[in-house]
């Protein structure tokens, strides 16, 4: 008789990444009988929620339910109805909500309360909404990329199943750039982690990992731009800010109240003789780079070596996956190729920033002007952060791999978060069974 396929025995999980600029919903799927195997969980859907990050709903919390509806309904469609009740839903909020909590814990709680109320109305197994720490964000990003790259599996392979794979078990470092914070996480080479706050110990699949991580709050690309503007307007002679990080001919009016709304600009706050100022782009990479460097305090270091602002950073080791905004920005600028040297990236950024705004708008007619206008700053910021902030060099640049997806799953903290909360990364190496359950009878 003919073999008949049994119904798929799969499980699903949902993670919402409530970032500072937007929220994304990810749906993951895995074979139920292979939960403890490495590399079996994969992303089946990403849904980007229309609108800003949840921290922007502080004055309109009643709109949060509608905001989340489309993506939650999409999850209802993608996941079979029979699986709804056993599908866990997690929401993790990152630096945008960390900043809101610094301003007002009560307001942050109110936002999360409404988010939780909205999400608990769906037929899934809602597990709560929380603000994850910067340390968690770094750690889970590191777990995600190494899980997807197959670094935790003990089987050595003579063939490569994923790009960037070097057939050894050396883990990749993780570089994550968001709108409000940036994380650096890696296993240093036999180096003591001098600052306990930056040390993580994991036992995964029978192997111990001593991991360094740090999250720089206020050094995501959006908050870094606010910081730079607040710093530069201090020395402007009038309400015109000639800014090298924007294209020549670009103009934008900024409200001083918006500039000082974020805790990230508090250190630059001063009484200005105007309520608004106008940014006028002059498009000069070198000057933009110099201005950005002033955000990094490198004059003080209580350790053997530091990144910036007195934060310990061990010597860089191995390959790094750079994802989230590191990838999105470099992808837009067409600079993600492994063959592009750091010198070439710098050269191309110089040319890009110098292009007139009218020309840029014509070349990228389909891109929203708000985003388009900031790529010169963002690209320059990425170079400044990686080179001067984290001490990558022209030589070690080739160890940075700008990664969007690995085997169809987005690089980012959400997969690692779900793997941890569903206990799918065992501390010990699972015993391999001679035969897996057959899916045919």
């Amino acid at each position: 008789t003919q073999n008949k396929a049994l119904p798929e025995n799969v499980k699903y999980g949902i993670v919402l990444d409530a970032g500072s600029s937007h929220t994304s919903l990810y749906i993951y799927k895995w074979p139920a009988e292979k939960e403890n195997d490495t590399g079996v969980v994969h992303q089946v859907e990403e849904c980007r929620v229309k609108g800003p990050g949840i921290s922007k709903f502080v004055q309109k919390v009643n709109e949060i339910g509608i905001y989340l509806t489309d993506c939650m309904e999409r999850a209802r469609e993608v996941i079979p109805r029979s699986q709804h009740q056993e599908t866990p839903v997690y929401l993790g909020a990152t630096a945008g909500m960390r900043l809101l909590r610094m301003e007002s814990e009560e307001l942050a709680d109110r936002v999360l309360d409404v988010v939780e109320r909205s999400l608990s109305n769906y037929p899934f197994d809602f597990q709560g909404a929380r603000i994850i720490t910067g340390q968690e964000e770094g750690a889970y990003g590191w777990i995600t990329i190494n899980y997807l790259l197959g670094k935790f599996s003990q089987k050595t392979r003579w063939f490569s199943i994923v790009p960037y794979e070097t057939n050894n078990q050396e883990t990749f470092g993780a570089l994550d750039l968001g709108g409000a914070s940036t994380q650096v996480t890696f296993v240093p080479q036999n180096q003591t982690i001098e600052s306990p706050d930056n040390a993580l110990q994991f036992r995964l699949y029978g192997k111990d990992y001593n991991v360094y991580t740090h999250s720089f709050l206020c050094y995501g690309k959006d908050q870094a731009l606010w910081q730079k503007l607040a710093k530069d307007i201090q020395v402007a002679s009038n309400e015109i800010l000639r800014d090298p990080c924007f294209h020549p001919g670009y103009k934008k009016v900024v409200n001083v109240s918006d500039l000082y709304k974020t805790p990230c600009t508090k250190r630059f706050e001063m009484t200005l003789p105007f309520q608004q100022f106008e940014i006028q782009g002059i498009g000069n990479y070198q000057q933009c780079h110099q201005s950005i460097l002033e955000l990094f305090n490198t004059s003080y270091c209580p350790y053997s070596q530091c990144a910036f602002n007195g934060i310990f950073l061990p010597p860089l080791q191995g390959d790094f996956g750079a994802f989230s905004a590191f990838y999105f920005v470099m992808k837009f600028l067409n600079l993600t190729s492994e063959k592009v040297s750091q010198e070439k990236v710098t050269e191309m950024m110089k040319k890009f920033c110098a292009q007139p705004w009218e020309e840029i708008k014509t070349s990228y007619a389909g891109v929203k002007e708000k985003y388009l206008s900031e790529y010169c700053f963002s690209g320059t910021y990425i170079l400044s952060l990686l080179l001067q902030g984290y001490h990558f060099t022209a030589d070690s640049w080739e160890h940075i791999h700008f990664i969007g997806k690995i085997q169809g799953s987005d690089a980012g903290w959400t997969l690692g978060y779900m793997l941890n909360l569903t206990n799918m990364i065992p501390a010990e190496q699972p015993l391999s069974t001679p035969l897996s359950h057959s899916t045919y009878v």
Epitope: D109, R117, G128, R130, I131
Partner: antibody, heavy 121, light 107 residues
């Protein structure tokens, strides 16, 4: 809206135990810690301890260790505070109060209406 | 444990006057961990101020908090009839402790 509703007044004999309940509504129960604070007649506020309803972990003030037990029932969104070996000095109004979310600070935003426990022979 | 001492024990003032309540800690307290509550007879306490100076939601702006380290102050800029009550400060450092309270009564 967020509400904490406590069980009614109790009269107990010295040496007995009392169990006070606090039912939460209007929010996701597991997301916030719950504290217990008591107030003897005409006196100030005295913190007794807290419970994390998500995992059931507890932290008791040193003074009450060994005599107090805080538990929760997630199916009914209720926390309980049991005080044993009662003495007359335990006569007080007992309040439950909602504490922080994970990563927050310990301020008590929402309070129950209070439960008067009288210990008398 | 950290001991909080409130003074004065009783403050007799008239409506419209300014009230200044003091809370002193036996050792330094992070301002993130200091709060003020108001309690009226027969009612549960009500949160007024947290983070030493952040007003809780719905609290009128005549209430303000200040201070750092070991010395904290609650100020009521113009007393309204409904403000006559007992005020407690509270700190958190491993364990929560409350001050003994200050009673604000009508003169």
């Amino acid at each position: 809206q967020v509400q904490l509703v406590q069980s009614g007044a109790e009269v107990k004999k010295p040496g007995a135990s009392v169990k006070v309940s606090c039912k939460a509504s209007g929010y996701i129960f597991k997301s916030y810690e719950m504290h217990w604070v008591r107030q003897a007649p005409g006196q100030g506020l005295e913190w007794m301890g807290r419970i994390n309803p998500s995992v059931g972990s507890t932290w008791y003030a040193q003074k009450f260790q060994g005599r107090v037990t805080m538990t929760r029932d997630t199916s009914t969104s209720t926390v309980y505070m049991e005080l044993s070996s009662l003495r007359s000095e335990d006569t007080a109004v007992y309040y439950c109060a909602r504490g922080k979310r994970e990563g927050g600070t310990e301020y008590l935003r929402v309070w129950g209406q209070g439960t008067l426990v009288t210990v008398s022979s | 444990e950290i001991v909080l001492t409130q003074s004065p024990g009783t403050l007799s003032l008239s409506p419209g006057e300014r009230a200044t309540l003091s809370c002193r800690a036996s050792q330094s307290v992070s301002s993130s961990y200091l709060a003020w509550y108001q309690q009226k007879p027969g009612q549960a306490p009500r949160l007024l101020i947290y983070y030493a100076s952040s007003r809780a939601y719905g609290i009128p702006d005549r209430f303000s908090g200040s201070g750092s380290g070991t010395d904290f102050t609650l100020t009521i800029s113009r007393l309204e009839p409904e403000d006559f009550a007992v005020y407690y400060c509270q700190q958190y450092h491993n364990a929560i402790t409350f001050g003994g309270g200050t009673k604000v009564e009508i003169k």
